[in-house]
């Protein structure tokens, strides 16, 4: 439902996708019960949500992962919500950290990130994790989205 | 504050209620500092939030639970946000999983779920957990809500 | 972007600040990639977000902390989102609890709180934790905000 041609609703919710890439940037897809309100927000290269209009956005991500303390590095599992704006440095908007579980073979944990940020036209947001191979891609476990206020 | 008769604010926030039922669906109540904006969203049978208008909604749930690895099944504690729409499959919208704690008698953990979804008129959302007896019902620990964009 | 003079957007996102104070109330600052939409929401005394207009608000907080079971009290780490309204008792809106980690020297964990609440003019919201010395203040780890529906 539109608020009016001048002020349409802008929202997205995308679903995690397992990837063979070694990058720490999570991959997403428009599959399952996804949301893509219109072309004022787009999923680019399966990795970032890009907005066409300036404004305040509530941006969120949820990451479920399965890790084991002995099999992982000593550093915790960290999920970061990051921002790329044209002509600006990339920035970390939000981060969450969870120490690895002692459960075997691995222990599942879920992280939720969310906050209100001003985005410029052409700004992109993406999610980084310390070890993408530990991320759970079962139905509903890992997702990423935004809504324009 | 209303946006106008044609576009009233629609929001709800309900509070967890302990239940003697053996169902995995959590029970909720309009008690404490709850929110129920108007009759365009209702709490039905103490278990599901039902909306009358189609549109994009941000839906969230928070579940705090107390469990112990030895006393629990090997499977993690999972909270699921689910959707019922007339004439459609029930769906899992979001899930989070936390491995049980080794703390005794039990270790508390909190899960937060949230995302943007399109709901049809008459659609209902509800929260499932693997073991409702482990859920914490102290003030503020477990709640469920939505807001229409 | 404003909705109109009568109905401007109201939103805030503030960043955690380490404090030498012994109080359990977390301290916040307008620094880094913060949001403060206008003077209809203000950060007071670095500790509470205060709103000038009545209405429904989505309020959220994220707290990352690092603790160890042996070095901490037996009680879990609890984060509380609290409300102060003129002439009313303070109230707990939301709480989350996480048992301390067995990781050494400490194990990091993140908590996310969020919900929709009616606020009165002059109402303030703030975040309490059981042990502020355990809170992580690295970029993006701990933040607090709201948006008016």
């Amino acid at each position: 439902m539109q608020k009016g041609d001048q002020n349409p609703q802008i929202a997205a919710h995308v679903i995690s996708e397992a990837s063979s890439k070694t990058t720490s940037v999570l991959q997403w897809a428009e599959k399952g019960y996804y949301t893509m309100s219109n072309n004022l927000v787009t999923l680019e290269n399966g990795k970032q949500l890009t907005v066409k209009r300036q404004g305040l956005y509530y941006i969120y991500a949820q990451v479920t992962f399965c890790s084991n303390r002995e099999a992982s590095s000593q550093a915790p599992f960290i999920a970061s919500l990051c921002l790329k704006s044209p002509g600006r440095f990339e920035r970390i908007l939000l981060r969450a950290a969870n120490t690895h579980s002692s459960a075997k073979p691995c222990g599942q944990q879920s992280i939720h990130l969310g906050g209100v940020f001003e985005l410029q036209p052409g700004a992109s947001v993406f999610v980084n994790v310390t070890d993408p191979s530990q991320v759970s891609h079962g139905t509903g476990f890992t997702s990423f989205g935004l809504l324009k206020l | 504050m209303q946006k106008g008769d044609q576009n009233p604010q629609i929001a709800a926030h309900v509070i967890s209620e302990a239940s003697s039922k053996t169902t995995s669906v959590l029970q909720w109540a309009e008690k404490g500092y709850y929110t129920m904006s108007n009759n365009l969203v209702t709490l039905e049978n103490g278990k599901q939030l039902t909306v009358k208008r189609q549109g994009l909604y941000y839906i969230y749930a928070q579940v705090t639970f107390c469990s112990n690895r030895e006393a629990s099944s090997q499977a993690p504690f999972i909270a699921s946000l689910c959707l019922k729409s007339p004439g459609r499959f029930e769906r899992i919208l979001l899930r989070a999983a936390n491995t049980h704690s080794s703390a005794k008698p039990c270790g508390q953990q909190s899960i937060h779920l949230g995302g943007v979804f399109e709901l049809q008129p008459g659609a209902s959302v509800f929260v499932n957990v693997t073991d409702p007896s482990q859920v914490s019902h102290g003030t503020g620990f477990t709640s469920f809500g939505l807001l229409k964009l | 972007m404003q909705k109109g003079d009568q109905n401007p957007q109201i939103a805030a996102h503030v960043i955690s600040e380490a404090s030498s104070k012994t109080t359990s109330v977390l301290q916040w600052a307008e620094k880094g990639y913060y949001t403060m939409s206008n003077n209809l929401v203000t950060l007071e005394n670095g500790k509470q977000l205060t709103v000038k207009r009545q209405g429904l608000y989505y309020i959220y907080a994220q707290v990352t902390f690092c603790s160890n079971r042996e070095a901490s009290s037996q009680a879990p780490f609890i984060a509380s989102l609290c409300l102060k309204s003129p002439g009313r008792f303070e109230r707990i809106l939301l709480r989350a609890a996480n048992t301390h980690s067995s990781a050494k020297p400490c194990g990091q964990q993140s908590i996310h709180l969020g919900g929709v609440f009616e606020l009165q003019p002059g109402a303030s919201v703030f975040v309490n934790v059981t042990d502020p010395s355990q809170v992580s203040h690295g970029t993006g780890f701990t933040s607090f905000g709201l948006l008016k529906l």
Partner: nanobody, 123 residues
Framework: EVQLVESGGGLVQPGGSLRLSCAAS????????MGWFRQAPGKEREFVAV????????LYADSVKGRFTISADNSKNTAYLQMNSLKPEDTAVYYC????????????????WGQGTLVTVSS
């Protein structure tokens, strides 16, 4: 499009069991979820159970929880509904349905449907 063929319906006494099968053919790689609905005489079609192809997650209607079990054999592109402790109120035509990938939350995507199989619970 996906073609669905149900089998396994019939007459059974209260407390008895039946196993329904639903064989899928055609664009089976495009199936996101498979499940069952039922329609009793003079009533609307209602959801019974669903299984997600990605990870085997399942959901059930309250009325059948603990009695019915949905499962799938991906190698045979077949979904099953094991129905135990059957009651007279379970009498209905049972329809298999498949939901395609990428339907999205903003689209009321069309399901593919089977022709239905009749289950009668009576003594």
């Amino acid at each position: 499009e996906v073609q669905l063929v149900e089998s396994g319906g019939g007459l059974v006494q209260p407390g008895g069991s039946l196993r329904l099968s639903c064989a899928a053919s055609g664009r089976t790689s495009n199936i996101y979820a498979m499940g069952w609905f039922r329609q009793a005489p003079g009533k609307e079609r209602e959801f019974v159970a669903v299984i997600y192809s990605s990870d085997g997650s399942t959901l059930y209607a309250d009325s059948v929880k603990g009695r019915f079990t949905i499962s799938a054999d991906n190698s045979k592109n077949t979904a099953y509904l094991q129905m135990n402790s059957l009651k007279p109120e379970d009498t209905a035509v049972y329809y298999c349905a498949a939901e395609p990938y990428g339907s999205g939350s903003s689209l009321m995507s069309e399901y593919d449907w089977g022709q239905g199989t009749l289950v009668t619970v009576s003594s």
